[in-house]
């Protein structure tokens, strides 16, 4: 559904996504209309589903930090729109609320 608004993630995935297959992430924030805070990881393969994860988990924080310091291979779409082929894993329609794209900083290498 090209141009469709992103739905809310309702529950966290039990599986973890390997760091090297993730392209970027975006934050879902309850203050913007979704029921739970979440991090949605976008796989490099656009045909694969986003993965909804708990921002309090150690592995999620590690992956977010890694992505924050890595220059994005391509500029993410502006706004917060569903990628072609995104999954319907426990999400409900909420318009474009609750959806915040996190751009990755273009920092030079080094911690």
């Amino acid at each position: 559904s090209d141009g469709g608004a992103q739905d809310c993630c309702l529950k966290y995935s039990q599986r973890k996504i390997p760091a090297k297959v993730v392209r970027s992430y975006r934050k879902q924030e309850p203050s913007l209309g979704c029921s739970i805070p979440a991090i949605l990881f976008l796989p490099r393969k656009r045909s694969q589903a986003e993965l909804c994860a708990d921002p309090k988990e150690l592995w999620v924080q590690q992956l977010m930090q890694h992505l924050d310091k890595t220059p994005s291979p391509q500029k993410p779409a502006q706004g917060c729109r569903k990628d072609r082929g995104a999954s319907k894993t426990g999400k409900k329609g909420k318009g474009s609320k609750g959806c915040k794209r996190t751009e990755r900083s273009q920092t030079p290498k080094g911690p």
Epitope: K16, P18, A19, K20, K56, E57, L58, W59, Q61, Q62, L63, Q65, H66, K69, T70, P111
Partner: antibody, heavy 117, light 107 residues
Framework: EVQLLESGGGLVQPGGSLRLSCAAS????????MSWVRQAPGKGLEWVSA????????SYADSVKGRFTISRDNSKNTLYLQMNSLRAEDTAVYYC??????????WGQGTLVTVSS | SYELTQPLSVSVALGQTARITCGGD??????ASWYQQKPGQAPVLVIY???ERPSGIPERFSGSNSGNTATLTISRAQAGDEADYYC??????????FGGGTKLTVL
């Protein structure tokens, strides 16, 4: 200056307990995961435990699971390691290390724990 | 449990290139890091995310990681490079594993 300073090491008998502390300064403590890493005399590095930014999520090496507990007090910029049921093989220098993504970018100088009767 | 295997020791002639390997089941699918430790000192990060250098680490240090082997390469080896080197990697648990360490001798 970014700094980590461990304390609390010492001599303890087998079966005893000890609590290590790591005081952090020079950076925003609650923006980083933290880990404990140990090194037995003359041996290599062994990761012990890690904790997420706010302390919600914790992870342990199999060798210490059920005996050691990692925690943090972000208001005091301090990381802790509570060590119970200590064994001779727990004798080591214990380092605290700051985690960023998938690596440790800042290390303390270590504190020596000796388990002996 | 996951294991990383390093050679116990590697020797290199002054000014030549040293390569230290770190073997692990599909380590190329994870991010590897490398730490230098000199006697009586804490470890220091020299390579992270397979091949990135922290600020302050000479360009002579580089890394690669694919398949079952991560490699630390030190070109134009200097006497000051003599140290123990450890590879490290996180698995998905997440738990961290270090290799057994490699003693680098510069001849």
């Amino acid at each position: 200056e970014v700094q980590l300073l461990e304390s609390g090491g010492g001599l303890v008998q087998p079966g005893g307990s000890l609590r290590l502390s790591c005081a952090a300064s020079g950076f925003t403590f609650n923006s980083y995961s933290m880990s404990w890493v140990r090194q037995a005399p003359g041996k290599g590095l062994e990761w012990v435990s890690a904790i997420s930014m706010e302390g919600y999520s914790k992870s342990y090496a199999d060798s210490v699971k059920g005996r050691f507990t990692i925690s943090r007090d972000n208001s005091k910029n301090t990381l802790y390691l509570q060590m119970n049921s200590l064994r001779a093989e727990d004798t080591a220098v214990y380092y605290c290390a700051r985690g960023y993504g998938y690596y440790f970018d800042v290390w303390g100088q270590g504190t020596l724990v000796t388990v002996s009767s | 449990s996951y294991e990383l295997t390093q050679p116990l020791s590697v020797s290199v002639a002054l000014g030549q290139t040293a390569r230290i390997t770190c073997g692990g089941d599909s380590i190329g699918s994870q991010y590897a890091s490398w730490y230098q430790q000199k006697p009586g000192q804490a470890p220091v990060l020299v390579i992270y995310d397979d091949n990135e250098r922290p600020s302050g680490i000479p360009e002579r240090f580089s890394g690669s990681n694919s398949g079952n082997t991560a490699t630390l390469t030190i070109s134009r080896a200097q006497a000051g490079d003599e140290a123990d080197y450890y590879c490290g990697s996180w698995d998905s648990n997440p738990t961290h594993v270090f290799g057994g360490g490699t003693k680098l001798t510069v001849l």
